[in-house]
Interface confidence: low
């Protein structure tokens, strides 16, 4: 890995990329750009996706935190071969596809889309997209999109969440280096400590909660601090502030020592959440201390 | 535009099987699923089952489970139904629709004529 | 299955009046991960099959007149006709798509008083 910025935050990541005939000469920089941008999320607990669209969507690899599935998943990428049309609703089929399946097995766990295209989407391949990205939103995932050369960043627009998902490559495909930086900020979503990581045992505390992204939320009302107790009863706290580096949460009151609350944090009123390797445990403390 | 166009009425005798196609047009065929719906005479609406017509993956009623087969045809844009065994109750007007999504079976946004299937000996 | 139960069967409003019908399902539709209300309405008339009115809850089918509408969220659901029309005489039906079997309301019945 190559250093520099990286993202903590445990969530779904799916890569949807265009491998129309029009990237035929360009694979290999959209390649470098997934890989190098795969290569800076490195919490365990993210899970990962590559998806590829042509005439035909496919799912080169299906979500899975197993770091050495991703890097097999990478050399697959490496291999495509690139032809047929930009049917980008395919790609988003794949990812709701996935998305579906993991919500119904009882997971509740964040999902982010990064589309990948080249090129101006024809009428009716527009309504396609747009209508299939609006599907995967309604499955609750995120989307942003990346457009190179001869995008339309309107259409763009409206296939992600917002003009604000949308990162356009204006310089063509080896300018796409360019924006990981800016994608891996606002894409990124991540708790990085727990202020203080040890509480005493049936008492009261508020908890600051470190890390980045946490006003990316729609609506930062929606924000709530999480705490799964012994892997098992979990615990949805209102946060007092929130600020796109830390929230001011309260703690639950744990009565035992040795108790572990694991934190999490939804940004949607508990439907779904970033997870975190921060453990918060409980102490004894002597009167006075 | 969109228009799914069945085939006529039928006529049979209980035990026998029937088959129903559905010929949609105006819109891609596996980019929506189709589903199946009856209505018995002056009564309300049944769903039967419905088929992705990109996968071939089928969901099913328990009422007509094992006795109702699904099927699509990609090169003529037309869905099928047989129902098998039929019964007297099975005496109803029968309904292909359109299926908002290919894969998970959601809310029915065009509807073929009917199919009037008659069982009686 | 998810039993879904209409009231009233059948009702009886003055042209420009409004028009409520009730549908209730045996469990929630609303699918806590996206907080939509996996529920539909049709419009059945005589000698027709059923037409889409209202999907996910309250979200007008294109075409739909705007005197319709749909709220509710969980198990308890409205179509609402704010000015009854002539043309609105007809059966209409809710369906719940949380889950397989699908399943439809009985059905109401709207007529002109």
């Known amino acids: 890995e190559d250093g520099g910025p990286a993202c903590y935050g445990g969530f779904d990541l799916y890569f949807i990329l265009d491998k129309s005939g029009s990237v035929l000469h360009h694979w290999n920089e959209i390649y470098y750009f997934v890989e190098q941008l795969a290569h800076k999320f490195i919490s365990p607990q993210l899970r990962m996706s590559f998806i590829v669209f042509s005439t035909r969507g496919t799912t080169l690899m299906k979500l899975t935190e197993d770091r050495e599935q991703i890097r097999q998943g990478l050399e697959e990428l490496q291999k495509v071969l690139p032809g047929g049309d930009t049917y980008m609703h395919e790609g988003f089929e794949r990812a709701s596809e996935q998305i579906y399946y993991e919500n119904r097995q009882g997971y509740r766990t964040a999902s982010v889309i990064i589309a990948l295209t080249d090129g101006e989407l024809h009428e009716d391949l527009f309504f396609y997209s747009e209508r299939e990205a609006n599907r995967s939103r309604d499955l609750g995932a995120i989307v942003y999109c990346v457009g190179v050369k001869d995008f339309n960043e309107t259409q763009l627009a409206r296939i992600a969440d917002s003009k604000d998902h949308v990162f356009p490559v204006n310089d063509g495909f080896q300018a796409l280096q360019g924006i990981i930086h800016s994608i891996l900020k606002k894409s990124c979503i991540e708790i990085l400590a727990a202020e203080p990581s040890t509480i005493c045992a049936g008492e009261s505390f508020q908890v600051v909660v470190r890390g980045n992204g946490f006003r990316h939320a729609r609506n930062v009302d929606r924000v709530l601090c999480s705490f799964k107790i012994n892997d098992s009863v979990t615990l949805n706290e209102k946060p007092f502030s929130v600020e796109d580096t830390y929230l001011l949460c309260p703690a639950p009151i744990l009565k035992e020592v040795g108790m572990k609350a694991a934190l999490q944090v939804s940004m949607n009123d508990g439907l779904s959440f970033i997870s975190s390797s921060v453990i918060i445990t409980t102490t004894h403390c002597s009167d006075g201390s | 535009q969109v228009q799914l166009v069945q085939s006529g009425p039928e006529v049979k005798k209980p035990g026998a099987p029937v088959k129903i196609s559905c010929k949609t047009s105006?819109?891609?065929?596996?980019?929506?699923?189709i589903t199946w719906v009856r209505q018995a005479p002056g009564q309300g609406l049944e769903w039967l089952g419905w088929?992705?017509?990109?996968?071939?993956?089928?969901s099913f009623a328990q009422k007509v489970q094992g006795r109702l087969t699904m099927t699509t045809d990609i090169s003529t844009n037309t869905a099928s139904m047989e129902l098998r065994g039929l019964r007297s109750d099975d005496t109803a007007l029968y309904y292909c629709?359109?299926?908002?999504?290919?894969?998970?079976?959601?809310?029915?946004?065009?509807w073929g004529q009917g199919t009037l299937v008659t069982v009686s000996s | 299955d998810v039993v879904m139960t209409q009231s009233p069967d059948s009702l009886a409003v003055s042209l420009g009046e409004r028009a409520t019908i009730n549908c209730k399902s045996s469990?929630?539709?609303?699918?806590?991960?996206?907080?939509?209300?996996?529920l539909a309405w049709y419009q059945q008339k005589p000698g027709q099959p059923p037409k889409l009115l209202i999907y996910?809850?309250?979200t007008r089918e294109s075409g739909v007149p705007d005197r319709f509408s749909g709220s509710g969220s969980g198990t308890d659901f409205t179509l609402t006709i704010s000015s009854l029309q002539a043309e609105d005489v007809a059966v209409y039906y809710c369906?719940?798509?949380?889950?397989?079997?699908?399943?439809f309301g009985g059905g109401t019945k709207l007529e002109i008083k």
């Open positions: 629709a359109r299926v908002f999504s290919r894969y998970i079976p959601f809310y029915f946004d065009s």
């Open positions: 105006g819109y891609i065929f596996d980019d929506y699923g």
């Open positions: 088929i992705s017509t990109y996968n071939g993956k089928t």
């Open positions: 469990q929630s539709v609303l699918y806590s991960y996206n907080n939509k209300n996996y």
């Open positions: 996910w809850a309250s």
């Open positions: 369906q719940q798509y949380y889950s397989t079997p699908l399943t």
